[in-house]
C-alpha cells in the first residue's frame, strides 16, 4: 500500500431532522448531533437546499428560510469536523416540506402587494381558473412587528381582481424595512389550495403624489417647487416633471434625479421640499405643470412604481385667439 496521508474520518449522519412552519412562510429545520461522533471533533453542520442552493456551514443545529410555500422545499444536512468546504461531510439527511394540498388550478394567481406611501399595504389577486364563482377569500398577513398572524378585513373587488388592504406603517429608527411581509390567501371553506407570497419592504413601494407649492418665472425659466409625499426623504425619490404649453401645444417631460432648492429664486429651508428649474418657457403663455415621483435604488430595491400625478398647477396667461 501507498504511504499517503490518511483520509479524514467521515462523521455519522445527523439525527432527528425535522421541519416546521412558523408564522406563514418561515420554514425551520432542526436536528440533533450525530450519535457516536468522534470525541476530538468540533462539530459543524453542512446544509443546502434541494437544488444545491445556499450552501451553509455553521455550528447551529437549526436552519430557517423565509419562503412562499407554493412549492415543495427540501433541506439536506450533514455533519463534519471543520468549516472547510472541501471536507467531505457525513451522509446527507434530507427533509422536505410540501405546500398545503389542493388542486393547483384552484389557487389564486397573480398575488402581489404594493406598499402605499409606507402607510398601508394593498394586495390583489385573481381567482384560480378551477374555482367556484362564489368563493369567499381571506388574506392573512404577518411581519416582525406583529405578535401573531392577522386577517385582512377590507376585501374588495376591482374588475376581475380581488384585493385587501391593511395598515402597515413604517417604524422610524428601526430595521423594519429590512424585513418582509408574509402573505397567504385561501378561501373560507377550505376548498382551494392556499397561495403564499413574501413582500420585501424595500420593494413595491408606491408613494403618494407630490403637492406643487409654487410656480414662478425668472427670465425665461420656470421655477417649480413642490412638497414630497409624507414618509419619504427627497434623496430617496426620483421625479418626473411634465410641462404643457397651451399656445405651442408642446408637452415636455423632464426626468429629475436630484431636485435641490439651491437657487436664490426658490423658497429656502422648507422641510421635505424639492425644486426644479424648467429652462426656456414662454412667460406670456399658459403653462400647466404636474409632477409624479417614484422610489429610487439609493434607498429601495424597486424603482418601477410611479405615484399618481400631482394636481396640476398653471402659470402665465392664456392668449386670446384673434
Amino acid at each position: 500500500g501507498g504511504g499517503g496521508a490518511a483520509p479524514t474520518e467521515t462523521q455519522p449522519p445527523v439525527t432527528n431532522l425535522s421541519v416546521s412552519v412558523e408564522n406563514l412562510c418561515t420554514v425551520i429545520w432542526t436536528w440533533n448531533p450525530p450519535e457516536g461522533a468522534s470525541s476530538n471533533c468540533s462539530l459543524w453542520y453542512f446544509s443546502h437546499f434541494g437544488d444545491k442552493q445556499d450552501k451553509k456551514i455553521a455550528p447551529e443545529t437549526r436552519r430557517s428560510i423565509e419562503v412562499p410555500l407554493n412549492e415543495r422545499i427540501c433541506l439536506q444536512v450533514g455533519s463534519q469536523c471543520s468549516t472547510n468546504e472541501s471536507e467531505k461531510p457525513s451522509i446527507l439527511v434530507e427533509k422536505c416540506i410540501s405546500p398545503p394540498e389542493g388542486d393547483p388550478e384552484s389557487a389564486v394567481t397573480e398575488l402581489q402587494c404594493i406598499w402605499h406611501n409606507l402607510s398601508y399595504m394593498k394586495c390583489s389577486w385573481l381567482p384560480g381558473r378551477n374555482t367556484s364563482p362564489d368563493t369567499n377569500y381571506t388574506l392573512y398577513y404577518w411581519h416582525r412587528s406583529l405578535e401573531k398572524i392577522h386577517q385582512c378585513e377590507n376585501i374588495f373587488r376591482e374588475g376581475q381582481y380581488f384585493g385587501c388592504s391593511f395598515d402597515l406603517t413604517k417604524v422610524k429608527d428601526s430595521s423594519f424595512e429590512q424585513h418582509s411581509v408574509q402573505i397567504m390567501v385561501k378561501d373560507n371553506a377550505g376548498k382551494i389550495k392556499p397561495s403564499f407570497n413574501i413582500v420585501p419592504l424595500t420593494s413595491r413601494v408606491k408613494p403618494d403624489p407630490p403637492h406643487i407649492k409654487n410656480l414662478s418665472f425668472h427670465n425665461d425659466d420656470l421655477y417649480v417647487q413642490w412638497e414630497n409625499p409624507q414618509n419619504f426623504i427627497s434623496r430617496c425619490l426620483f421625479y418626473e416633471v411634465e410641462v404643457n404649453n397651451s399656445q405651442t401645444e408642446t408637452h415636455n417631460v423632464f426626468y429629475v434625479q436630484e431636485a435641490k432648492c439651491e437657487n436664490p429664486e426658490f423658497e429656502r429651508n422648507v422641510e421635505n421640499t424639492s425644486c426644479f428649474m424648467v429652462p426656456g418657457v414662454l412667460p406670456d403663455t399658459l403653462n400647466t405643470v404636474r409632477i409624479r415621483v417614484k422610489t429610487n435604488k439609493l434607498c429601495y430595491e424597486d424603482d418601477k412604481l410611479w405615484s399618481n400625478w400631482s394636481q396640476e398647477m398653471s402659470i402665465g396667461k392664456k392668449r386670446n385667439s384673434t
Epitope: E105, T109, E110, L126, P127, R129, N130, T131, S132, P133, E158, G159, Q160, Y161
Partner: antibody
Framework: EVQVLESGGGLVQPGGSLRLSCAAS????????MTWVRQAPGKGLEWVST????????YYADSVKGRFTISRDNSKNTVYLQMNSLRAEDTAVYYC???????????WGRGTLVTVSS | EIVLTQSPDFQSVTPKEKVTITCRAS??????LHWYQQKPDQSPKLLIK???QSFSGVPSRFSGSGSGTDFTLTINSLEAEDAAAYYC?????????FGQGTKLEIK
C-alpha cells in the same frame, strides 16, 4: 359605453404573419382579462388565447401554441394577437372579447376576418 | 379538457313556442357554464352567466338552469328575432370550451 374593436385582418399566404389589434374603451382596461375567440366559416366558436388584466397570466389553445403570441399595452387600452406560421385552418373571423367575473365574455367586438390562402 | 355537447344541433320552431336547448359537460363544472347567442352575421352576445343568472338587458323569456354536468337554456314564447345560433361555454379550468352550437330557425 363599453366596447372593443378589432383590426388588422386580411389575406395572407400560408406560412405568413399577421398582427391583430383590439382597442378597448369605456372600462378600466387593466382590471380585465382579454380574450381572442375565432370562428371558421360556417363553424362554431373556438377559444384562441387569453391574457390577464396585468398581463402576467397568458393562455393559449393547443392549436395555436408556439405560433401565436398575445400581448397587451395597458397604457393604450389595446390587446394584440401576433399570428405567425399561419395555416389554411387558421382562416376565421377573429373576435376580441372582454372577460368579466369568473371567466365569461360580456363584451365582444365585431370581428376581423383572417384568410390564409395561396 | 371539458367537452360540451349540445342538443339538438338544429331546431325549427314557430313563434310563441317554448324552446329548450340542453348542454352536457363531460365532467362536473359546477355552475361555470354560460350561454351565448349569435345572430346571423353578428358577433356573439352573452345571455346567461353561471348557468342561471340572466345578463343585463337580456329579455326575461331567456332563462338557464342546471349545475354539475347537465344544463338547459329555455326560451319561453319564442319571437322571430330569436333566430340565431346558441352556444354553451365552460369556464371551469382551461382551455375554455364551447358547445358545437344549436341553430334555431323560425318557421
Amino acid at each position: 359605453e363599453v366596447q372593443v374593436l378589432e383590426s388588422g385582418g386580411g389575406l395572407v399566404q400560408p406560412g405568413g404573419s399577421l398582427r391583430l389589434s383590439c382597442a378597448a374603451s369605456g372600462f378600466t382596461f387593466s382590471n380585465y382579462a382579454m380574450t381572442w375567440v375565432r370562428q371558421a366559416p360556417g363553424k362554431g366558436l373556438e377559444w384562441v388565447s387569453t391574457i390577464s388584466g396585468r398581463g402576467y397570466s397568458i393562455y393559449y389553445a393547443d392549436s395555436v401554441k408556439g405560433r401565436f403570441t398575445i400581448s397587451r399595452d395597458n397604457s393604450k387600452n389595446t390587446v394584440y394577437l401576433q399570428m405567425n406560421s399561419l395555416r389554411a385552418e387558421d382562416t376565421a373571423v377573429y373576435y376580441c372579447a372582454k372577460e368579466e367575473g369568473h371567466w365569461y365574455f360580456d363584451v365582444w367586438g365585431r370581428g376581423t376576418l383572417v384568410t390564409v390562402s395561396s | 379538457e371539458i367537452v360540451l355537447t349540445q342538443s339538438p344541433d338544429f331546431q325549427s320552431v314557430t313563434p310563441k313556442e317554448k324552446v329548450t336547448i340542453t348542454c352536457r359537460a363531460s365532467q362536473s363544472i359546477g355552475s361555470s357554464l354560460h350561454w351565448y347567442q349569435q345572430k346571423p352575421d353578428q358577433s356573439p352576445k352573452l345571455l346567461i352567466k353561471y348557468a342561471s343568472q340572466s345578463f343585463s338587458g337580456v329579455p326575461s323569456r331567456f332563462s338557464g338552469s342546471g349545475s354539475g354536468t347537465d344544463f338547459t337554456l329555455t326560451i319561453n314564447s319564442l319571437e322571430a328575432e330569436d333566430a340565431a345560433a346558441y352556444y354553451c361555454a365552460s369556464s371551469r379550468g382551461l382551455p375554455y370550451t364551447f358547445g358545437q352550437g344549436t341553430k334555431l330557425e323560425i318557421k
